[in-house]
Interface confidence: medium
């Protein structure tokens, strides 16, 4: 079906500054697969740290921090010839605009570390 | 505390299922750091696939797919004693409710794979 010319593209510079958003969330149970134990079983394991902000939705965000600088080898030892690095993802959150307007929000971007991966280091050779 | 006249009307039958959201995004340049090359250097490398939907904000989302079932070892070969697995994150996006209502959106959850990590497999012993 052709798009209604009255519907601006969300990336358009003329896109409305304020929109009405329904909080009846679609795909509410998309998360029925629960958090995995990859953080423990990874060769670049990570811990989860609680980031809480009561003026934001979601109020509590758990951020990954790599446990080691190196990666865990088959023997369970940390190999410093490899690097554990965070995989970061930009997410949208809702920021309450004002305490006096509890139902007015602003979109905010946040960069969160979701987990860690093991990479080969970049070797800088001296001249 | 008296209600701010600029706030959405609490008498509205849809209140507070609908809220006002400003799209004047805070921390817009949070991702000004150049995308890393971890996807290529990881022992669990991945490719990025473009997921585009004009009725969604953001319209373009990049999803990771692990290149191998196993992980890449120091010799550059795939070791099938280890597993490459996607690290998934649930994100909030805005879905246009109707082509005829350009300023009405609904929050939607999406599960996206951000990257891959290398894990020790769970061994199921036969009885």
């Amino acid at each position: 079906m052709p798009r209604n010319p009255g519907c601006p593209n969300a990336e358009d510079k003329n896109f409305p500054q304020n929109v009405k958003v329904s909080l009846n969330i679609l795909n509410k149970s998309v998360n029925s697969r629960r958090p995995s134990d990859y953080y423990n079983r990874s060769t670049s394991p990570w811990t989860l740290h609680r980031n809480e902000d009561r003026e934001r939705y979601p109020s509590v965000i758990w951020e990954a921090k790599c446990r080691h600088l190196g990666c865990v080898n088959a023997e369970g030892n940390v190999d410093h010839h490899m690097n554990s690095v965070p995989i970061q993802q930009e997410i949208l959150v809702l920021r309450r605009e004002s305490q006096h307007c509890p139902h007015s929000f602003r979109l905010e971007k946040m960069l969160v570390a979701v987990g860690c991966t093991c990479v080969t280091p970049i070797i800088h050779h001296m001249a | 505390m008296p209600r701010n006249p600029g706030c959405p009307n609490a008498e509205d039958k849809n209140f507070p299922q609908n809220v006002k959201v400003s799209l004047n995004i805070l921390n817009k340049s949070v991702n000004s750091r150049r995308p890393s090359d971890y996807y290529n250097r990881s022992t669990s490398p991945w490719t990025l696939h473009r997921n585009e939907d004009r009725e969604r904000y953001p319209s373009v989302i990049w999803e990771a797919k692990c290149r191998h079932l196993g992980c890449v070892n120091a010799e550059g070969n795939v070791d099938h004693h280890m597993n490459s697995v996607p690290i998934q994150q649930e994100i909030l996006v805005l879905r246009r409710e109707s082509q005829h209502c350009p300023h009405s959106f609904r929050l939607e959850k999406m599960l996206v794979a951000v990257g891959c990590t290398c894990v020790t497999p769970i061994i199921h012993h036969m009885a």
């Epitope: 909080l23 979601p58 109020s59 965000i61 | 649930e90």
Partner: antibody, heavy 126, light 107 residues
Framework: EVQLVQSGAEVKKPGESVKISCKAS????????ISWVRQAPGQGLEWMGG????????DYAQKFQGRVTITADESTTTAYMELSGLTSDDTAVYYC???????????????????WGQGTTVTVSS | EIVLTQSPDFQSVTPKEKVTITCRAS??????LHWYQQKPDQSPKLLIK???HSISGVPSRFSGSGSGTDFTLTINGLEAEDAATYYC?????????FGQGTKVDIK
């Protein structure tokens, strides 16, 4: 550790209303939801409805729709459940339960009830 | 609404024995299934969340498994203090619903 403390026992007559409070301490009140669950004598658990504090959204079980109202007062970190048009069938212990709202390891909204109030006994009798 | 059916309704068990309680959902609920323990005149207590995730402070003898429509709560080596009623709870679809409960008694 989140603690939920409920108001005391109530005795009501048929047709009356009851309003029970649930005071939360420990943890940010806005970071979780509160559900209300009741248990009739010798019976199982029955979910009545819940509120998500951040947006103030309420969800009610169809059975109680129109008869139950769940509210929250952030300034006192207290949730309330009001049930009207009481009958003897509403004689039960009423519990408030915390529903976490964490973006846990990349996931929004965990829906287990990880902390419960001590329960409020409501007796409806003429 | 989603109906959860627990079995058995009642179980009398000797200490140190293994107890298995099952919970069947009327439709697929993924892993949105939680287990609670309720002792007489007490509030329910969360034992297992999301089918198999353990809760800190809950003894390791309690474990959960299953996904989709069939779930199991296992108590490995029952202790006297485990005498209680056990409930399963689904949070996949509103309204939240509970199983009818399984009463576990010590012989």
């Amino acid at each position: 550790e989140v603690q939920l403390v409920q108001s005391g026992a109530e005795v009501k007559k048929p047709g009356e209303s009851v309003k029970i409070s649930c005071k939360a301490s420990g943890g940010s009140f806005r970071s979780y939801g509160i559900s209300w669950v009741r248990q009739a004598p010798g019976q199982g658990l029955e979910w009545m409805g819940g509120i998500t504090h951040f947006f103030g959204i309420t969800d009610y079980a169809q059975k109680f729709q129109g008869r139950v109202t769940i509210t929250a007062d952030e300034s006192t970190t207290t949730a309330y459940m009001e049930l009207s048009g009481l009958t003897s069938d509403d004689t039960a212990v009423y519990y408030c339960a915390r529903e976490p709202n964490d973006f846990w390891n990349g996931y929004y909204d965990t829906h287990d009830f990880d902390s419960w109030g001590q329960g409020t006994t409501v007796t409806v009798s003429s | 609404e989603i109906v959860l059916t627990q079995s058995p309704d009642f179980q009398s068990v000797t200490p140190k024995e293994k107890v298995t309680i099952t919970c069947r959902a009327s439709q697929n609920i993924g892993s949105e299934l939680h287990w609670y323990q309720q002792k007489p005149d007490q509030s329910p207590k969360l034992l297992i969340k999301y089918a198999s995730h353990s809760i800190s402070g809950v003894p390791s003898r309690f474990s959960g498994s299953g996904s989709g429509t069939d779930f199991t709560l296992t108590i490995n080596g029952l202790e006297a203090e485990d005498a209680a009623t056990y409930y399963c709870h689904q949070s996949d679809t509103l309204p939240h619903t509970f199983g009818q409960g399984t009463k576990v008694d010590i012989k």
